[in-house]
């Protein structure tokens, strides 16, 4: 789901799940602004005071990052230009489950979308040949 309208931009997320102890991806896309220097990406989590991750002016800005995510997050910096604001979350924990907000600012406006992130010990489906 996403939002759009005057002075706002469309941001799209996809609900996903992460395996405990492995790396996970929180998916978020937007219509890319060709002017990278104007793009800000913020990831927030319900109930968490600090930011999950912030990317602005072409680089990570982690001064306001919450301690529980320290050293565990990254965006795909080379893919922001094509509208990929997805977050890589390393070493997924049970407590990482919850509602996340992907918040985007560009020269055109602002937009955000929420996603539900589930965590657990998910086994790979068996394939019978």
């Amino acid at each position: 789901f996403g939002i759009s309208g005057r002075h706002s931009i469309t941001v799209t997320t996809v609900a996903s799940a992460g395996n405990i102890g492995e790396d996970g991806i929180l998916s978020c896309t937007f219509e890319p602004d060709i002017k990278l220097s104007d793009i800000v990406i913020q990831w927030l989590k319900e109930g968490v005071l600090g930011l999950v991750h912030e990317f602005k002016e072409g680089k990570d800005e982690l001064s306001e990052q919450d301690e529980m995510f320290r050293g565990r997050t990254a965006v795909f910096a080379d893919q922001v230009i094509v509208g990929n604001a997805s977050l890589r979350l390393k070493n997924v924990q049970l407590t990482d489950a919850g509602t996340y907000k992907c918040y985007i600012i560009t020269s055109k406006g602002k937009g955000n979308a929420n996603l539900e992130y589930k965590t657990g010990a998910f086994s790979m489906p068996e394939v019978n040949v």
Epitope: E31, I34, I81, V82, K108
Partner: antibody
Framework: EVQLLESGGGLVQPGGSLRLSCAAS????????MHWVRQAPGKGLEWVAS????????YYADSVKGRFTISRDNSKNTLYLQMNSLRAEDTAVYYC?????????WGQGTTVTVSS | DIQMTQSPSSLSASVGDRVTITCRAS??????LNWYQQKPGKAPKLLIY???SLQSGVPSRFSGSGSGTDFTLTISSLQPEDFATYYC?????????FGQGTKVEIK
């Protein structure tokens, strides 16, 4: 095969107009931003204009602002550059290019000559 | 505007030589730099994006490095088909700007 094909170039008098087209094939055109880049005879590359995938973001070089208009028709897989009030210094080969992490796909170019 | 300055403007080299071209930005562009190769009468071809990522299909003898303001394109062992003009380009901010080009000629 991923391909871009420019057309619409030619000889035009100073003050005249031309409309360049760039036909895209082999990829989902509506998912990509696009650029126009030009190259004057014997010179280097100069960025002209850019447009995002849904036309939400449009940028121009100062040298063409107010005279050139970039647009696209995603239903026709085509990029356009409307050039008005042409000047001798606009003489160049004009390339369209796909916007990815780099300008990863280029057309063969179309020549625009502005001369009286 | 961000100015991109390449050096040298031209160089002469032999097949098998290691060739290095530098590009300097007038302000920090993080890693948002591309390298292109252009042969006479042809469209440019993307070689390196995001300063050091090799574009699909480009030979591994091409490599890029650097971040901030100083960048390098290296051809580890020059091949006959590598004689061309090379351009750097920043895509951190508009206007998008190219370096003036470096022409690699046969010695």
């Amino acid at each position: 095969e991923v391909q871009l094909l420019e057309s619409g170039g030619g000889l035009v008098q100073p003050g005249g107009s031309l409309r360049l087209s760039c036909a895209a094939s082999g990829f989902t055109f509506s998912s990509y931003g696009m650029h126009w880049v030009r190259q004057a005879p014997g010179k280097g590359l100069e960025w002209v204009a850019s447009i995002s995938s849904s036309s939400g973001y449009i940028y121009y070089a100062d040298s063409v602002k107010g005279r050139f208009t970039i647009s696209r028709d995603n239903s026709k897989n085509t990029l356009y550059l409307q050039m008005n009030s042409l000047r001798a210094e606009d003489t160049a080969v004009y390339y369209c290019a796909r916007a990815s992490s780099g300008m990863d796909v280029w057309g063969q170019g179309t020549t625009v000559t502005v001369s009286s | 505007d961000i100015q991109m300055t390449q050096s040298p403007s031209s160089l002469s080299a032999s097949v098998g030589d290691r060739v290095t071209i530098t590009c300097r930005a007038s302000q920090s562009i993080r890693s948002y730099l591309n390298w292109y190769q252009q042969k006479p009468g042809k469209a440019p071809k993307l070689l390196i994006y995001y300063a050091s990522s090799l574009q699909s299909g480009v030979p591994s003898r091409f490599s890029g490095s650097g971040s901030g303001t100083d960048f390098t394109l290296t051809i580890s062992s020059l091949q006959p088909e590598d004689f061309a003009t090379y351009y750097c380009q920043q895509y951190y901010s508009t206007p998008l700007t190219f370096g003036q080009g470096t022409k690699v000629e046969i010695k």
